[in-house]
């Protein structure tokens, strides 16, 4: 089902997908169809640099997972960028987190045996007012 440039080496303990007893409960086609057909280079993919709470992109890679690469946001500053381009610590940069579903190879190194897994990823950062605790 996963058509890719290289083949995941087969673990001898993998269930045999040709076996009549191989569970057929769920068949997942990993080719995602409703994607935009092209990408405009002028499209705003640079929010991570232009945001008032900019972030760096960390390449979260795991060969035992599909998708094997997930881009995660790491906020660059504790504060936010003000109109002068300086970091203002009266505001806070915080990550925006999203729970997503991924497929985890199980047993490990098996090319066509997966289990569904939920993971929490940071998809960007936003600027918030800090919570101020007043001490009596």
């Amino acid at each position: 089902i996963v058509k890719a440039g290289i083949t995941i080496p087969r673990n001898p303990g993998c269930p045999n997908s040709e076996d009549k007893n191989f569970p057929r409960t769920v068949m997942v086609n990993l080719n995602i169809h409703n994607r935009n057909t092209n990408t405009n280079p002028k499209r705003s993919s640079d929010y991570y640099n232009r945001s008032t709470s900019p972030w760096n992109l960390h390449r979260n890679e795991d060969p035992e997972r599909y998708p094997s690469v997930i881009w995660e946001a790491k906020c660059r500053h504790l504060g936010c960028i003000n109109a002068d381009g300086n970091v203002d610590y009266h505001m806070n940069s915080v990550p925006i987190q999203q729970e997503i579903l991924v497929l985890r190879r199980e047993p490990p190194h098996c090319p066509n045996s997966f289990r569904l897994e939920k993971i929490l990823v940071s998809v960007g950062c936003t600027c918030v007012t800090p919570i101020v605790h007043h001490v009596a």
Partner: antibody
Framework: EVQLLESGGGLVQPGGSLRLSCAAS????????MNWVRQAPGKGLEWVSG????????FYADSVKGRFTISRDNSKNTLYLQMNSLRAEDTAVYYC???????????WGQGTMVTVSS | QSELTQPPSASGTPGQRVTISCSGS????????VYWFQQLPGTAPKLLIY???QRPSGVPDRFSGSKSGTSASLAISGLRSEEEADYYC???????????FGGGTRLTVL
């Protein structure tokens, strides 16, 4: 069979422009990240640019930032590299690479030569 | 100058085990997976190792990769004359938001 075929290289004067293309076949193009890597004559490999998450993110080496633009057309299974304001130091073989099950650089094209000279 | 440091050359005799090192920093090797490539003379590079120690199908198990801290290494056991080539390491760099390659190691089979 998975294949990448680069084209568009050639001789160009300093300050000129070129557009490289990389035609892909044998796989679902839109699913995978693509990179351009170059190799100057007699030198090592240098990453140039990459496009990920169906174009959601594009990255560039500092040496080409502001001059080169990477893009892809999933309907044509083609990756592009628009190169402007070319310099002599951009002279190299440019390779198109595909990242799939292993994450990156699984498959390489044969390369296309770009020569920047007056 | 490359962000990842490799010895410019290495050598070994047929059947021998050779190791090629690759040194980086926390933002690249220390935080991300390492890739290794083989480039035979006059050909495009070929992926040898991905995700530190994983071999694509078709790559013999004589090739192995490992990583510790901010350094990585490629080991080739049972060296063959046809493995005389240039070997490169690479890793994503979080600080640069880009890939960094080593300068390459030319392996000579004596």
């Amino acid at each position: 069979e998975v294949q990448l075929l680069e084209s568009g290289g050639g001789l160009v004067q300093p300050g000129g422009s070129l557009r490289l293309s990389c035609a892909a076949s044998g796989f679902t193009f839109s699913e995978y990240e693509m990179n351009w890597v170059r190799q100057a004559p007699g030198k090592g490999l240098e990453w140039v640019s990459g496009i990920y998450s169906s174009g959601g993110y594009t990255f560039y080496a500092d040496s080409v930032k502001g001059r080169f633009t990477i893009s892809r057309d999933n309907s044509k299974n083609t990756l592009y590299l628009q190169m402007n304001s070319l310099r002599a130091e951009d002279t190299a073989v440019y390779y198109c690479t595909l990242g799939s099950a292993g994450g990156a650089f699984d498959i390489w094209g044969q390369g296309t030569m770009v020569t920047v000279s007056s | 100058q490359s962000e990842l440091t490799q010895p410019p050359s290495a050598s070994g005799t047929p059947g021998q085990r050779v190791t090629i090192s690759c040194s980086g920093s926390y933002s690249n090797i220390g935080s991300n997976y390492v890739y290794w490539f083989q480039q035979l003379p006059g050909t495009a590079p070929k992926l040898l190792i991905y995700s530190n120690n994983q071999r694509p199908s078709g790559v013999p198990d004589r090739f192995s990769g490992s990583k510790s801290g901010t350094s990585a290494s490629l080991a080739i056991s049972g060296l063959r004359s046809e493995e005389e080539a240039d070997y490169y390491c690479a890793a994503w760099d979080d600080s640069l938001s880009g890939w960094v390659f080593g300068g390459g190691t030319r392996l000579t089979v004596l």
